[in-house]
Amino acid sequence: QVPPQYPPIQSIRVQFTRCENEKGCIITSPSKDETMKVQDNSIIINCDGFYLISLKGYFSEELSLSLYYRKGRGPLFSLSKVTSVDSIGVAYLAFKDKVYFNVTTHSTSYKDIQVNGGELILIHQNPGGFCAY
Amino acid sequence: QVPPQYPPIQSIRVQFTRCENEKGCIITSPSKDETMKVQDNSIIINCDGFYLISLKGYFSEELSLSLYYRKGRGPLFSLSKVTSVDSIGVAYLAFKDKVYFNVTTHSTSYKDIQVNGGELILIHQNPGGFCAY
Amino acid sequence: QVPPQYPPIQSIRVQFTRCENEKGCIITSPSKDETMKVQDNSIIINCDGFYLISLKGYFSEELSLSLYYRKGRGPLFSLSKVTSVDSIGVAYLAFKDKVYFNVTTHSTSYKDIQVNGGELILIHQNPGGFCAY
């Protein structure tokens, strides 16, 4: 008898090379075979459970950056007046949540902020829980 | 043939809104369907393996806080003279371990410390290993 | 029918008590039943996917320490002029990668650096993905 295989874990790595003031960061998924999807510049959550979240990036200007998952809820991350980020967190997310950026800069002298090494990773920690596809 | 499902991962999120000097923090599990249990103000470990541990909170007074798992062993986290915590760690825990707080304050003018956003998350990282229920 | 068990997750905890200038840290695996292996002072990656990485240690001298996984790629961790480390990260690693230390000290008066509590943990986060053994 063949031992059972793991179904694929819900996870995604998105990259971002540009953020816009009063908007967010433009995210792209470099891999076609990710188990989670990007839609309207947000990562779509289909499975309830804890997620390991890693956020990295080096910014061309000082900015304030927040990562949200649901309207009316506090941010997953919130960084004020930084030029880089390297943070890890754990959060409980649920079906219908959407993970997206909000960015504020403190100058009007530039249109956008360049990002080197911009990377956001989400990894589901509770396979076997509720998922809706 | 139905593809195999993951058995539920051992994980828990507990909240704490109050810590007592020379004692610990009073933890409660907001969800009834957690796969790990709270007993005598401690989280009970049934499964051997690595655990991802997330600890957050904002305290009404400066305190020193440690998170222990076994008598005679060093703490999982140890924070000295802080008013907030936002930490992530990885530790190997085993059956019979119990995860609990110890708190010390540096003033005699109050008994209790109020906590906003007090949250402790444990997520087992080695399903398939030894568990005793 | 017996519910399916998880196959063991790829994970390892190595310890290091000594680092050598211009070289690395001598790593040993205290447990015989780890699911990952150490070879030539490197941790061998057999499975593609995200890894949770925890690095801790207290050093007898100030040093600069990097943790690499592939020639020509940036480090997983890079710490400059530190006497301790307690870091967590997430990285995508793949078959044929090797995780190893590089250390530089800033004194010629000693060859070896002693390490207390030196620990490196890797935990695979994408079971079910590609593995080569």
């Epitope: 990295k56 080096y58 002298s109 249109k111 956008d112 990002v115 090494g117 | - | 940036g74 997983l76 890079s78």
Partner: antibody
Amino acid sequence: EVQLVESGGDLVKPEGSLRLSCVVSGFTFNNYGMSWVRQAPGKGLQWVAYISIDGRSTSYTDAVKGRFTISRDNAKNTLYLHINSLRTEDTAVYYCTKLGRGFTFGYWGQGTLVTVSS
Amino acid sequence: SYVLTQLPSKNVTLKQPAHITCGGDNIGSKSVHWYQQKLGQAPALIIYYDSSRPTGIPERFSGANSGNTATLTISGALAEDEADYYCQVWDSSVSVFGGGTHLTVL
């Protein structure tokens, strides 16, 4: 005063290797991203590689990917460019640059000449 | 990859305005930086974020950027402004330079 001093340029044969160094002073090295920019004789500027403040993020122009490696030693205030499998078209003056606002190349060294010829 | 197009050379009469252009697809949506390189010297930043001047750069240098063209303007060119001028942008974590324009002051 900000100073960037490159060294390591030389005459090398095709397929050879070199390591360029850039020692900096006058600013807190580990607070700034760095880049290498090159200029072939009589030609324009070409960006070569970028490295973040801590060395964990790097990027390269397509022409050098897999052959060049940028690195830094913050303790020694030194930026490096390891060059392998050299080609004649890699002949150029290589400038070390400090990144400023907007990832501009705010300060430049005087350059070091790499000549690839058989 | 993103391409920036500059005219190889441009002549200007002493004390007259000089306009150096840099073309790129929808370049107006990007931040453009300009560098001056005098003969035998390393380049130097003269304009950043389309139109901002670093400390020490004379007021006669200005910049603009919209549509598919960014422009560096020298309001009254001096002999010391004879040099090569390069535009630069970042695109997807990769930096791109224009081919450069050699400005001759007559």
